[in-house]
């Protein structure tokens, strides 16, 4: 950056280098240029010479003076216009920063996805700071008093392997950067209470010619987790309301729900899991398209789903299925 | 259907080590969970460790720290590694097999003894 080049003189910020963001500062210029007497000194700002607000404190001293600083990043350079020299000479630069103090962090929330081997915790930051802000994440076993600090920008990955302290633990996050610190609430968990199940997935419908026409949804999870509650929702695409269904669940087979939908109509379906009785939801499946067919046998398949709906004996589309939820991180 | 075939039970002493192999004769992909069960005599199936077709893993809380699943994708095969075993650990272990949207599959088991 800017702040590596070699100075004659040199350059401070008042209040300081990094401040909050709508603050009042001053740049100060020394210079220290042999043989120069400086006749004028200038300020750049990002490269661009500053007009205003310069004043001429002494003879190799002037300030720059800004009102409500809004930038979060800047740099800043000064220089000397030296008598018998034909260009200006460089004094010194800076970086300068301004942003806010962070904010308690909240919402702290710690899962462990199935087959991650990982304990997962995540908060709600709060506004943005602008500026470098680090979050230790202290977990305290309730069971040894022993805890663990983990250094982070953003979320963070525990290996449970780690985790030796028993099952019970205090987790809380302290956030900090140049201008402040603050700490979160303590998060009370339990590691057998914070599973969340490896994720369900749909991956067919078939709508069946009785004569009142069913449709069945097939879908399934890796799950090895025994009792297992889950919440299927739909709604035809043209409608803002969605209709759930709630099922308990074991997976030692492929799931088959059914529903009594209305014809030729496009559904949109999706599906979440929860270990029975615990506290967090995976994130909404992906979304499941299947239209129903006028009066014909129709099959939709999640490796399929094109929006190919032909006429016929029974139609099968077939779709690459990533197509994401409008609440993924729905885990609370 | 797909049968599977696991190997390696046997008497082993208090603290030993044993390796139990599970060999399908279909292939597995991603979308495949193999796990191992074990039952003691008059007791239920229980869980005792799983492995994702992308290498992820699951253990039984009894089992963490001993005993080690892994796979190897290319021989289609499950392996189960259990170290510093107790007289608890004995029982029939059973392969299982679970494909994503698809079948599930019980290998014969293969019985493991403890001594003290």
């Known amino acids: 950056g800017i702040t590596n080049i070699n100075c004659s003189g040199h350059i401070w910020v008042e209040p300081a280098t990094i401040f909050k963001m709508g603050m009042n500062i001053s740049i100060y210029c020394q210079a220290a240029i042999k043989n120069c007497q400086p006749r004028k000194l200038h300020f750049y700002k990002n490269g661009i010479k500053e007009r205003f607000q310069i004043t001429r404190i002494n003879k190799t001293t002037a300030r720059l003076w800004y009102k409500n600083f809004l930038e979060p990043h800047a740099s800043m350079y000064c220089t000397a216009e030296c008598p018998k020299h034909f260009q200006e000479t460089l004094i010194c630069g800076k970086d300068i920063s301004s942003g806010y103090p962070p904010d308690i962090p909240d919402e702290v929330t710690c899962v462990i996805y199935e087959y991650s081997g990982n304990m997962t915790c995540t908060w709600n930051a709060g506004k943005l700071t602008y500026i470098d802000t680090k979050y230790v994440v202290h977990v305290k076993s309730l069971e040894t008093e022993e805890e663990q600090q983990y250094l982070t920008s953003s979320y963070i990955n525990i290996s449970t392997d780690s985790l030796q302290g028993g099952k019970k633990y205090l987790v809380w996050v302290q956030a900090a950067n140049a201008l402040g610190m603050e700490e979160s609430k303590q998060l009370q968990i339990h590691l057998d209470d914070i599973v969340i199940p490896s994720a369900a997935v749909i991956s067919r419908a078939e709508t069946i010619n009785a004569t009142v026409p069913k449709t069945i949804i097939y879908w399934d999870s890796q799950t090895t987790i025994e009792k297992v509650s889950c919440e299927m929702r739909y709604k035809a695409t043209t409608n803002q309301t969605w209709n759930v269904k709630e099922f308990d669940t074991n997976f030692t087979y492929v799931q088959q729900s059914e529903f009594y939908l209305e014809p030729n109509i496009k559904y949109v379906f999706q599906v979440r899991c929860q270990e029975t009785g615990k506290r967090y939801w995976q994130p909404w499946s992906s979304l499941f398209f299947h239209k129903t067919p006028e009066t014909v046998p129709q099959v939709t398949s999640k490796a399929f789903q094109h929006d190919t709906w032909n006429s016929g004996l029974t139609v099968a589309s077939i779709s690459t299925g990533h197509l994401t939820s409008d609440n993924r991180g729905d885990i609370g | 259907e797909v049968p599977l075939v696991e190997s390696g039970g046997g008497l082993v002493q208090s603290g030993g080590s044993l390796r139990l192999s599970c060999a399908a004769s279909?292939?597995?992909?991603?979308?495949?969970?193999m796990a191992w069960y074990r039952q003691a005599p008059g007791k239920q199936r229980d869980f005792v460790a799983a492995?994702?077709?992308?290498?992820?893993?699951n253990y039984a809380d009894s089992v963490k720290g001993r005993f080690s699943i892994s796979r190897d994708n290319a021989k289609n095969t499950v392996y189960l590694q259990m170290n510093s075993l107790k007289p608890e650990d004995m029982g029939v272990y059973y392969c299982?097999?679970?494909?994503?949207?698809?079948?599930?599959?019980w290998g014969q088991g293969t019985q493991v003894t403890v001594s003290s």
């Open positions: 492995v994702t077709g992308t290498g992820g893993t």
């Open positions: 299982y097999m679970r494909i994503l949207g698809g079948g599930r599959y």
């Open positions: 279909g292939s597995f992909d991603s979308d495949t969970v």
